[in-house]
Interface confidence: medium
Amino acid sequence: QPDAINAAVTCCYNFTNRKISVQRLASYRRITSSKCPKEAVIFKTIVAKEICADPKQKWVQDSMDHLDKQTQTPKT
């Protein structure tokens, strides 16, 4: 049984309808909580703005792959 209604619950109720340039993205996190209406990806941009995106869209998947590779590649 969850102990809090709201604390640490973040949901996406709608998705952006614009593709965001991968150069503008800093990180992402997946939203899979059963408290939320749909699975989602929250991208954080380089100016720290968070935007909801649909994980089923190809550009979202590609962006996540790109960010994953960025974090795996050691910076020289």
Partner: antibody, heavy 128, light 110 residues
Framework: QSLEESGGDLVKPGASLTLTCKAS?????????MCWVRQAPGKGLEWIAC????????TYYASWAKGRFTISKTSSTTVTLQMTSLTAADTATYFC?????????????????????WGPGTLVTVSS | AYDMTQTPASVSEPVGGTVTIKCQAS??????LSWYQQKPGQPPKLLIY???TLASGVPSRFKGSGSGTEYTVTISGVQSDDAATYYC????????????FGGGTEVVVK
């Protein structure tokens, strides 16, 4: 569009009581809660508990209410509050309220709830 | 534990004046704050949610503001119909919470 509480009564200390909240014409979407709030005579509002009106039926309690109060969703339009070991301090009007979630687009939002619909209340008096 | 402290406990203002009610949370509640109006013998009525958004049908003379731990509701051009008790409520967390409501502020309109 209404909520109506029933079951309030005059009971003796130590007794148990079950209150019922019946909804009419209220939309219980997956992202709303049914809650109980009480108010002792001449005092402020005191949140007791909420139950998720969606499929999960998850329950949430004020720290003081855990163990002695039990909220349950008994049907798609009915919620109950079971109260045990009642004392004079439990004397109050008990309100049923819908907690609704608000959000913004397309930015992430925490589940922000406010009680947007209330019943008229039912009076519980605990006295010997 | 997200305790809500409301001030003042009571305020008296003539018709047309301005009433300001403050609500302080013991920890940041990130704008997860609502305000309610309650008249004697009636259930509370939602006025403001998400700290500053007016609920449907609420007159524009009510204004909510604040952030972090400090929040305010202001009634400008107060009317006799505004005489009531006002409560704030945090909805940031229900974990280990004793009460999500503030203690209330009685508004008397002279």
């Amino acid at each position: 569009q209404s909520l109506e509480e029933s079951g309030g009564d005059l009971v003796k200390p130590g007794a148990s009581l079950t209150l019922t909240c019946k909804a009419s014409g209220i939309d219980f979407s997956l992202y709303s809660y049914m809650c109980w709030v009480r108010q002792a005579p001449g005092k402020g509002l005191e949140w007791i508990a909420c139950v998720d009106a969606g499929a999960s039926g998850s329950t949430y309690y004020a720290s003081w209410a855990k163990g002695r109060f039990t909220i349950s969703k008994t049907s798609s339009t009915t919620v109950t509050l079971q109260m045990t070991s009642l004392t004079a301090a439990d004397t109050a009007t008990y309100f049923c309220a819908r907690g609704i979630l608000y959000y913004t687009w397309p930015y992430p939002a925490g589940a922000i709830d406010a009680f947007d619909s209330w019943g008229p209340g039912t009076l519980v008096t605990v006295s010997s | 534990a997200y305790d809500m402290t409301q001030t003042p406990a009571s305020v008296s203002e003539p018709v047309g004046g301005t009433v300001t009610i403050k609500c302080q949370a013991s920890e940041s509640i990130s704008n997860y704050l609502s305000w309610y109006q309650q008249k004697p013998g009636q259930p509370p009525k939602l006025l403001i949610y998400k700290a500053s958004t007016l609920a449907s049908g609420v007159p524009s003379r009510f204004k909510g503001s604040g952030s972090g731990t400090e929040y305010t509701v202001t009634i400008s051009g107060v009317q006799s119909d505004d005489a009531a008790t006002y409560y704030c409520q945090q909805s940031y967390s229900s974990s280990n919470v004793f009460n999500t409501f503030g203690g209330g502020t009685e508004v008397v309109v002279k």
